[in-house]
Every structure is written in structure tokens, then in C-alpha cells.
């Protein structure tokens, strides 16, 4: 289990000509909010298909009213992160859709009106627990800058949040067969599996198969809130009206049956119907032994001579899981270089290479420029698997077919003059400034000496007025 987190940094006009009209006006003030939709794998599904990994909606941003005559700036954003919790393993590869919505706050009949301003989508590889990844996506004339990451919720760790960690019982080393939990070297990998159905929010376990409840929760799976006040009726009013939290009296509430057993109420209690291989009042006892052949895909069964002792499956290469039932995703190691598509054929790995690359792992860079032309005097630059054009002054785009003005985005700071140049642009800095784009004042203060405490920003600082 874990959380995918998305931080929107800015949403505003993209670079280049054709700045979009402001989405709000003095007559129609509005505010933005964002929606993110996540799907596992590198699927190219339609935007309408379900967000199988989860979805989230941001808060509303501050109200914005366009200043007449001013260029559309970056629009004010909602506070905070968008968080998409995931219950199972993090898939490592995922598709995302981020939508920017406008809420108009004029005198609409029947409340505010919503309209979709921009939608961006992409497919990414991402390991859980890694640093924030940054991204810029464009939708028409709009540009969205954002960061994202996936993090595991304790006790889960690892790039897929599938390993569990717990503090060491002995100071020097982990128990037999257990490894230290990188990066938490003071913790040990734990083969700890709580009772099936144990609430991940309100329950925990210190021994496999148990479910212990956090304060305020009860029931065999810690799904029943403990009463916090006296109530009017046996079932009590809802917490929304009085704050009274009362367990429903049904014996099957929260399903006390473990290991996929189904619960049915009896006049005095409950009864569990257990799946094959399990027995006991709550299906908590495994009746499977090595004699039953529980290990799949050629796994070797060890132990489990009688029903009360556990068996362990030692899996052959390429398989994992308590019964060797899962094929190891060897493609998760990303063996294909330069964006190649990995195919696990069982007996072998195969890489399907992008145009411009070859070799068993797509490691050979072919001549990207062979037979490719750049328009308007541009020259072809090799590398990256797709031909790139270095365009002549005044042209841009993939094949140098678009007219471009590198000075349109006001790239020079502090009053520097921008000049279009064959290499892109050149900033001629005002006296007292230097840097590629005049962003560094040589002597930032007019006074000959400063007070000992640094002044921070003052209204008189010359670099403030751009």
C-alpha cells in the first residue's frame, strides 16, 4: 500500500507566440482545480476508461479576475498535493491524465459552471520511494508544470511497496532468512502477513495471521468503531449527527473469516465456509501439506509433513509468491535501453527497439539522420533515437518548419536586451548585470557598505523592477 502524490507547480501560457486568452474575466471571475486519473501499465486507454489505480480531485484555487490589458500570467493554484492512495503493489509503470478545470463564479443559474480547460496525459516508469520526478506537459497553448512521486505507507517498503519492514528484535542482525530493509538498515524485512481482511488503516499485526486494533477500533478485522458516547437506540444514531460510533451487532460485520472464507450468520453466532485447503472456526488453519503439491511451476516443497506445520515453496528462477504462482516481471529491471519495449517471452527476454536503435538491448545508436531532412536551412543532429534538427535563426519545431521568435518569452532579466541569434538568443545586459540571461547583479546594493544583518528584499532594490 502507498500513496501517489502530485504537486502542481504552475499552469499558465506556454512559451512562444499565440498566448491563450485568460480563462477568467472581470465579468466572469473563476478559479481552477485539477483532477488526476491513474491507470496501471503503459496503457493508451481512452480518457473515459476507469482510473484503475485511483483518482483524486484538488481543492479549488484562489479566485482569479483578469486584469484588463495584462498578459495571461501563471494562474493561481490550489494549495496542497493531490494524493491518490493505492492499496496493492505499485505497478512501476503507469499512465496518467491530469485535467485542469475552470469553475466560473459569475451569476450562473443553478450554481457555478465547470468546464475543462486542458487535459494532459502520459505514460511513465516510476519506482516507489524514489525522489520527486519533474515534468512539463503542454496542452494547446497552455503549459502545466508538475512533480510526482510514489511512496509506500509503513510498514511497506521497496520499489513496488510489496516488502514489509519492522524494527530489529536483536541489535546486531536480522532473523534467519531475513535481510536488512534498505534504505532502513536498522529495520528487517518482515515476512509478516496479517489476517486476511485486517483493516490497513485501523489494524496491525506483530505475528503472522493476527489482527490487532488501534485505539478506537474493534472487531476481528478492526473495522468496527468503538462507541464513544451513550446512544439512543441499540444501533445508535450515525456519527454524522451525534458523534456516536456504535458497532452494528451483526456477527458477520467485517467478515471474521480469514483466507477468503465466506461468513453466514447463525442464530447464535456465525459460520465460516472455508476455501479448499483451510479449516478452523475462522478458516485460519491451513490444511495443506507438501503431499498436496502446493508449489506451482516446478517449485520445491519443504516441510509441512503434517497439517499443523507450514510448508515453504522454493521457487525456480522466474517465479515467486508463496506458492510460486507469480511469474517474476523481469522487465521491471528495465533491461531495454533507449526507450525500447521489453517483452518477457518466458524462455527469453526480447527488446523491441525504437526507431534509430538496434541490438539485443537496443544499445546501438544508428545513424538517426540517414535520409532525414530539416527544413529552412536546419541541420540534422544525431542522437536520442529520433532525429533532431538544429534550426536556423527564426525557425523552430521538430523539422524547422515553424517560425520562432526566441525573444518572445522575455528571456533576459533586469532590463537586458534580447537579440535573436543563430545559436538561439543573446542577452545584452544592462550595466551592472551579468549571466547568460542577465540574472546576476554584479553589485546588488547601491550603498558602499551594508548593515551586518542581510537586508533581504527591500523596495529600493534595483533588480526588483523588471
Amino acid at each position: 500500500a502507498g500513496v501517489f502524490e502530485l504537486q502542481i507547480h504552475s499552469f499558465g501560457p506556454g512559451p512562444g507566440p499565440g498566448a491563450p486568452r485568460s480563462p477568467c474575466s472581470a465579468r466572469l471571475p473563476c478559479r481552477l482545480f485539477f483532477r488526476v486519473c491513474l491507470k496501471p501499465g503503459l496503457s493508451e486507454e481512452a480518457a473515459e476508461s476507469p482510473c484503475a489505480l485511483g483518482a483524486a480531485l484538488s481543492a479549488r484555487g484562489p479566485v482569479y479576475t483578469e486584469q484588463p490589458g495584462a498578459p495571461a500570467p501563471d494562474l493561481p493554484l490550489p494549495d496542497g498535493l493531490l494524493q491518490v492512495p493505492f492499496r496493492d503493489a505499485w505497478p512501476g509503470t503507469f499512465s496518467f491524465i491530469i485535467e485542469t478545470w475552470r469553475e466560473e463564479l459569475g451569476d450562473q443559474i443553478g450554481g457555478p459552471a465547470w468546464s475543462l480547460l486542458a487535459r494532459v496525459a502520459g505514460r511513465r516508469r516510476l519506482a516507489a520511494g524514489g525522489p520527486w520526478a519533474r515534468d512539463i506537459q503542454r496542452a494547446g497553448a497552455w503549459e502545466l508544470r508538475f512533480s510526482y512521486r510514489a511512496r509506500c505507507e509503513p510498514p511497506a517498503v521497496g520499489t513496488a511497496c510489496t516488502r514489509l519492514c519492522r524494527p530489529r528484535s536483536a541489535p546486531s542482525r536480522c532473523g534467519p532468512g531475513l535481510r536488512p530493509c534498505a534504505p532502513l538498515e536498522d529495520e528487517c524485512e518482515a515476512p509478516l502477513v496479517c489476517r486476511a481482511g485486517c483493516s490497513p488503516e485501523h489494524g496491525f499485526c506483530e505475528q503472522p495471521g493476527e489482527c490487532r486494533c488501534l485505539e478506537g477500533w474493534t472487531g476481528p478485522l478492526c473495522t468496527v468503531p468503538v462507541s464513544t458516547s451513550s446512544c439512543l437506540s441499540p444501533r445508535g444514531p450515525s456519527s454524522a449527527t451525534t458523534g456516536c460510533l456504535v458497532p452494528g451487532p451483526g456477527p458477520c460485520d467485517g467478515n471474521p473469516c480469514a483466507n477468503g472464507g465466506s461468513c453466514s450468520e447463525t442464530p447464535r453466532s456465525f459460520e465460516c465456509t472455508c476455501p479448499r485447503g483451510f479449516y478452523g472456526l475462522r478458516c485460519e488453519v491451513s490444511g495443506v501439506t507438501c503431499a498436496d503439491g502446493p508449489c506451482f511451476n516446478g517449485g520445491l516443497c519443504v516441510g509441512g509433513a503434517d497439517p499443523d506445520s507450514a510448508y515453504i515453496c522454493h521457487c525456480p528462477p522466474g517465479f515467486q509468491g508463496s506458492n510460486c504462482e507469480k511469474r517474476v516481471d523481469r522487465c521491471s529491471l528495465q533491461p531495454c535501453r533507449n526507450g525500447g519495449l521489453c517483452l518477457d517471452l518466458g524462455h527469453a527476454l526480447r527488446c523491441r527497439c525504437r526507431a534509430g536503435f538496434a541490438g539485443p538491448r537496443c544499445e546501438h545508436d544508428l545513424d538517426d539522420c540517414a535520409g532525414r531532412a530539416c527544413a529552412n536551412g536546419g541541420t540534422c543532429v544525431e542522437g536520442g533515437g529520433a532525429h533532431r534538427c538544429s534550426c536556423a535563426l527564426g525557425f523552430g519545431g521538430r523539422d524547422c518548419r515553424e517560425r520562432a521568435d526566441p525573444c518572445a518569452a522575455r528571456p533576459c532579466a533586469h532590463g537586458g536586451r534580447c537579440y535573436a541569434h543563430f545559436s538561439g538568443l543573446v542577452c545584452a545586459c544592462a550595466p551592472g548585470y551579468m549571466g547568460a540571461r542577465c540574472e546576476f547583479p554584479v553589485h546588488p546594493d547601491g550603498a558602499s557598505a551594508l548593515p551586518a544583518a542581510p537586508p533581504g528584499l527591500r523596495p529600493g532594490d534595483p533588480q526588483r523592477y523588471l
Epitope: 507547480h9 504552475s10 501563471d74 519533474r134 508544470r145 532579466a413 549571466g435 547568460a436 540571461r437 540574472e439 546576476f440 547583479p441 546588488p444 528584499l457 532594490d461 533588480q463 526588483r464 523588471l466
Partner: nanobody, 117 residues
Framework: EVQLVESGGGLVQPGGSLTLSCAAS????????LAWYRQAPGKKRELVAG???????HYIESVKGRFTISRDNAKNSVYLQMNSLRAEDTAVYYC???????????WGQGTLVTVSS
């Protein structure tokens, strides 16, 4: 807003080395040009070294070949590696960031470097 926190200052002997670090945080750390300035007692604050958001580096003459500025975009940090330090390098060193998002400059609180035997 961008907040800048410097560290790594201290007392060092002439000819010694020191590395200053500056961590940027806040809502506008997306595209920053970063620099180190210094101010000796009774003198103006001056630019020492800068690194633009495209990675190009700029140094004043007196530190070329001795000081190296670098940045780690993943950590939103800038570093100043100072070698062959001289007494005239003694100053309060300030971290500076120019945000291309807000088009505003931001300053750290400063860290004291003293070169003395």
C-alpha cells in the same frame, strides 16, 4: 516564495579548502538561476560565481581556477567548492536565487567564511 539556507562556513587556514552549500525550498523552486555573493566588512556585496538554469557558469576574475560552482537540481541545491583560500576571501557569503517563474531575486541569510592562520 523561495527560501534559501546556507551552510558550510567556518574558519580555515590560508591555502585550505571549504565547500559551501545552499538548499532552496518553497513553491517557486522550479527554474532558478543560482549564485554566491560575498561581502567583506566595509565593502560592497559582490558576485563571486553564478550558475544559470541552463547550466552555464560565471565567475569573477579573482576566483577563477580556485572556486567551482555546481548545482544538484534533484536536491534544489547549489554548492561552492573553494580551494587555495586566501585572507582576502574572508567575508560573509550569501546564496542568491533568481526565479524565472516569479522574476524575483531571493537571498539567504549568509554564512561567515574566515581565512586566517
Amino acid at each position: 516564495e523561495v527560501q534559501l539556507v546556507e551552510s558550510g562556513g567556518g574558519l580555515v587556514q590560508p591555502g585550505g579548502s571549504l565547500t559551501l552549500s545552499c538548499a532552496a525550498s518553497g513553491s517557486d523552486v522550479w527554474y532558478l538561476s543560482l549564485a554566491w555573493y560575498r561581502q567583506a566588512p566595509g565593502k560592497k556585496r559582490e558576485l563571486v560565481a553564478g550558475i544559470s538554469d541552463d547550466g552555464s557558469r560565471h565567475y569573477i576574475e579573482s576566483v577563477k581556477g580556485r572556486f567551482t560552482i555546481s548545482r544538484d537540481n534533484a536536491k534544489n541545491s547549489v554548492y561552492l567548492q573553494m580551494n587555495s583560500l586566501r585572507a582576502e576571501d574572508t567575508a560573509v557569503y550569501y546564496c542568491y536565487a533568481y526565479s524565472w517563474k516569479t522574476r524575483f531575486p531571493y537571498w539567504g541569510q549568509g554564512t561567515l567564511v574566515t581565512v586566517s592562520s
